[in-house]
């Protein structure tokens, strides 16, 4: 939009905002931060939700792809008006519960969640946000934690998937739009090619998948590549080479001219997907060409 | 397909502890994200969520029933089981359990149980 | 936890369309499940999350969710329909239900 970096990965993308009490005056900074955050995840595949905690958890805008809606979710977002206390574990609730709804559909979308918040969390709520943000990773999802001001960067480290998912802001609220391009970066998981994108009918080829954020998987391990054929079967297979900006990836026999395979990957053996409109096709090919 | 069953007994005494067993099929309690809750009914009212139990063990209970209710599961066996402790004629209720994790997917066909001396 | 509050009743004609509410305290931002239960049954899931219907129940059963009223809606109402019906939603780790709706088919 602005000439900025941006992402185009198609997953479902959960903000959990903090509207307890103290950020009464710092609103307006945590709602550019999203703002600008969610201009910058521009794949039409990518679906976004709003939730907002206090003493309760609210899905303000829930998961959609329309970006009418997005805007109109943002519009609300401006409005709230903060109070109340730092239940954290309200707002990952309400984040799992539309993973599990989205699962229960039955094609499981990999799934982002940004949280966001300001305050340590007293003994028995880190308890509760840190057993809440587990539910979120079971049912497939990457946490990634923002902690302004008078955050405990060592709660946050067990509720994000680990201390590199945690973004520390220390010098306020202003400071948040200078931490949007490193999270950016390291929230994106995105495919933007595949290397050849034609292969021949029958033959058994290695395919090069470009795109960002391969390495961000909590296990490396379990990243695959997965190919969904004439919108049909899904094959997935095991990488031969896992690299931030690359994927070296065994690609299925297609055994007729014009079959098409959709790229997609997973961070979680095949628990979810991130999806991309990257298409292998197959032609024929002569012997010896 | 999808199954559940509840066993347990009929009648239980008023102060005695209800032991209800779910034996379901179809789905397994190891598998991220879902689990089984417990419900109760009693003649011609409202339904009445008990207890839950997650795929990775965690436990949820009604506040209002915290104290006299137990929720375990036996992942080798596909089975759920409730303990209500100091039973009461009010608990008297047809008991359900039914499979998900926020909504209710799948439902037994419930228990009758009767709390009388 | 949050509390919702349903109709004792509800009546409609065959064909036409019945609405059953849901209300709470801002029960839009959180999301609403309908069950339908008939005499002597366990409860059936109509819709789930606001508005999705699971494989095999009617497309006249429908859902919305906004501002602090759910409504499961059935349109073309037929005596098939008459039940009770709850919703439920998810707060604070527990599963909460509405007090039922009774649907009578006239």
């Known amino acids: 939009e602005d000439g900025g970096p941006a992402c185009y990965g198609g997953f479902d993308l959960y903000f959990i905002l903090d509207k307890s009490g103290s950020v009464l005056h710092h609103w307006n900074e945590i709602y550019y931060f999203v703002e600008q955050l969610a201009h910058r995840f521009i794949s039409p595949q990518l679906r976004m939700s709003f939730i907002v905690f206090s003493t309760r958890g609210t899905t303000l805008m829930k998961l959609t792809e329309d970006r009418e809606q997005i805007r109109q979710g943002l519009e609300e977002l401006q409005k709230v008006l903060p109070g109340g206390d730092t239940y954290m574990h309200e707002g990952f609730e309400r984040a799992s519960e539309q993973i599990y709804y989205e699962n229960s559909q039955g094609y499981r979308t990999a799934s982002v969640i940004i949280a966001l918040t300001d305050g340590e969390l007293h003994e028995d709520l880190f308890f509760y946000s840190e057993r809440e943000a587990n539910r979120s990773r079971d049912l497939g999802a990457i946490v990634y934690c923002v902690g302004v001001k008078d955050f405990n960067e060592t709660q946050l480290a067990r509720i994000a998937d680990s201390k590199d998912h945690v973004f520390p802001v220390n010098d306020g609220f202003q400071a948040l739009q200078g931490i949007i391009h490193s999270i950016l970066k390291k929230s994106c998981i995105e495919i933007l090619a595949a290397e050849p994108s034609t292969i021949c009918a029958g033959e058994s080829f290695q395919v090069v998948v470009r795109g960002n954020g391969f390495r961000h998987a909590r296990n490396v391990d379990r990243v695959l590549c997965s190919f969904k054929i004439n919108d049909s079967v899904t094959l997935n297979e095991k990488p031969f080479a896992v690299e931030d900006t690359y994927l070296l990836c065994p690609a299925p026999i297609l055994k007729e001219v014009g079959m098409k395979a959709a790229l997609q990957v997973s961070m979680n053996d095949g628990l979810s997907f991130i999806s991309s409109s990257v298409i292998i096709t197959t032609t024929h090919c002569s012997d010896g060409s | 397909q999808v199954q559940l069953k509840e066993s347990g007994p009929a009648l239980v005494k008023p102060t005695q502890t209800l032991t209800l067993t779910c034996t379901f099929s179809?789905?397994?309690?190891?598998?991220?994200?879902?689990?089984v809750s417990w419900i109760r009914q009693p003649p011609g009212k409202a339904l009445e969520w008990l207890a839950h139990?997650?795929?990775?063990?965690?436990?949820s209970y009604s506040t209002s029933l915290k104290t006299r209710l137990t929720i375990s599961k036996d992942t080798s066996k596909n089975q759920v089981v409730l303990t209500m402790t100091n039973m009461d004629p009010v608990d008297t209720a047809t008991y359900y359990c039914?499979?998900?994790?926020?909504?209710?997917?799948?439902w037994g066909q419930g228990t009758l149980v009767t709390v009388s001396s | 936890d949050i509390e919702l509050t349903q109709p004792p009743s509800v009546s409609v004609a065959p064909g036409q369309t019945a609405r059953i509410s849901c209300s709470g305290d801002?029960?839009?931002?959180?999301?609403v499940h309908w069950y339908q239960q008939k005499p002597g049954q366990a409860p059936v899931l109509v819709i789930y999350?606001?508005?999705k219907r699971p494989s095999g129940i009617p497309e006249r059963f429908s859902g919305s969710n906004s501002g602090n009223t759910a409504t499961l809606t059935i349109s073309g109402t037929q005596a098939e329909d008459e039940a009770d019906y709850y919703c439920?939603?998810?707060?604070?780790?527990?599963?909460?239900f509405g007090g039922g709706t009774k649907l009578t088919v006239l």
């Open positions: 439920q939603s998810y707060d604070i780790t527990s599963l909460v």
């Open positions: 999350a606001d508005s």
């Open positions: 801002n029960i839009g931002g959180i999301y």
């Open positions: 179809g789905f397994s309690l190891s598998t991220s994200g879902g689990g």
């Open positions: 039914a499979r998900g994790g926020y909504f209710l997917d799948y």
């Open positions: 139990i997650y795929s990775n063990d965690d436990k």
